[in-house]
Amino acid sequence: MAVTACQGLGFVVSLIGIAGIIAATCMDQWSTQDLYNNPVTAVFNYQGLWRSCVRESSGFTECRGYFTLLGLPAMLQAVRALMIVGIVLGAIGLLVSIFALKCIRIGSMEDSAKANMTLTSGIMFIVSGLCAIAGVSVFANMLVTNFWMSTANMYTGMGGMVQTVQTRYTFGAALFVGWVAGGLTLIGGVMMCIACRGLAPEETNYKAVSYHASGHSVAYKPGGFKASTGFGSNTKNKKIYDGGARTEDEVQSYPSKHDYV
């Protein structure tokens, strides 16, 4: 029961996490204009992995895609790659984990196969979560570096007569979504791995025990047994997990120049 709950919860947590990673990857607000010096702005800039946007006081919002691959910073490309790898691994992990769920019957799939699939999906979720966290963290680090660089030369101009305020960018909502989503996927993966340990039957070798009854001697050599299903020899010599009492249904069978942070 605990195994099923752990596996199910791991699946749900991972599902939420992967949905969050997808959402974060698609979001435009990876970096947003820093409003510390000017909290009331008529033009608000924000940028995502795929496009940059400008929202005006008038309510008009214009977004422009990054229509170049070669012109983009290597770090941005790396972040994109990490997020995509995270999504792909997560999606495959979800697919595998669906078939690995104890509550779903697929033909006569053995517990050992389910255990292996659970472990595989768990590892995939862990890697997926790590990819997302790494991607978001690389982007955040890039933002912090650029923030302090632009703060150092906040105002540039001719002899200080004309001021050109450099737009500084800070953490956008997508970063927080990405961190949380990555964390959830990671936790979900760990839960799946824990559930796998419960699913995987341990090889139990029972030593022959001699019972000396009065009159005649009978030696019992029992095979493995399934609790609540009666004793019987393990004729197929397959691993059977003694998981305590189980109910019947629990038995498994526009190109333009942009600021890139």
Epitope: V43, V54, S58, F60, D259
Partner: antibody, heavy 118, light 113 residues
Framework: DVKLVESGGGLVKPGGSLKLSCAAS????????MSWVRQTPEKRLYWVAT????????YYPDSVKGRFTISRDNAKNTLYLQMSSLKSEDTAMYYC???????????WGQGTSVTVSS | DIVMTQSPSSLTVTAGEKVTMSCKSS????????????LTWYQQKPGQPPKLLIY???TRESGVPDRFTGSGSGTGFTLTISSVQAEDLAVYYC?????????FGAGTKLELK
């Protein structure tokens, strides 16, 4: 056809109050950011207030902050400017405007005159 | 606050002449996010409210004759009328739309010789 009609102007004593109204028609009023702009007798233009569409964020220059309040009633398609603690320098023609791309004011009303004098 | 300075304050021209007026801002009006300059030009004829001519420094409002051209970037902007017509006699204002408070220039008055 877009139409903005201001009303509520008049003569008021210093320290007094006045509420200007702007009736909008010919466009989806609730979807647009609206502003008030005034023109002094010397023909200088000054931005007075802005109210965004949707959640209705408001913006004011320091010269009117705390004295003027911009508001809107989307059900009535009307923009308001509540003016209090009026000063002689508030004497001007007040225009109701609609904001468009580039934060530009694409439509202006005919204006309503406000005179602050004792 | 961004200070908008227009020059000259008045211009006397003859019909058909090419006219250029300047507008300078104390801070750059160029937004790095979309590479657009948040400067607007308005025309005001006597007894009328101002009328939008050009936004984003060079984008002509629909219905505005193509003899009106806006140019410039950063802090220096220009409004050019390629061939002045009698109906163009008015006061022209430039406005900062980049940051609050929105500020206007004092205007350039276009008069007929």
């Amino acid at each position: 056809d877009v139409k903005l009609v201001e009303s509520g102007g008049g003569l008021v004593k210093p320290g007094g109050s006045l509420k200007l109204s702007c009736a909008a028609s010919g466009f989806t009023f609730s979807s647009y950011t609206m502003s008030w702009v005034r023109q002094t007798p010397e023909k200088r233009l000054y931005w007075v207030a802005t109210i965004s569409s949707g959640v209705s964020y408001t913006y004011y220059p320091d010269s009117v902050k705390g004295r003027f309040t911009i508001s809107r009633d989307n059900a009535k398609n009307t923009l308001y400017l509540q003016m209090s603690s009026l000063k002689s320098e508030d004497t001007a023609m007040y225009y109701c405007t609609r904001l468009t791309k580039g934060n530009a004011m694409d439509y202006w009303g005919q204006g309503t005159s406000v005179t602050v004098s004792s | 606050d961004i200070v908008m300075t227009q020059s000259p304050s008045s211009l006397t021209v003859t019909a058909g002449e090419k006219v250029t007026m300047s507008c300078k801002s104390s801070q750059s009006l160029l937004n790095s996010g979309n590479q657009k300059n948040y400067l607007t030009w308005y025309q005001q004829k006597p007894g009328q409210p101002p009328k939008l001519l050009i936004y984003w420094a060079s984008t002509r409002e629909s219905g505005v004759p193509d003899r009106f051209t806006g140019s410039g970037s950063g802090t220096g902007f220009t409004l050019t009328i390629s061939s002045v017509q009698a109906e163009d006699l008015a006061v022209y204002y430039c406005q900062n739309d980049y940051s609050y408070p929105f500020t206007f220039g004092a205007g350039t008055k276009l008069e007929l010789k």
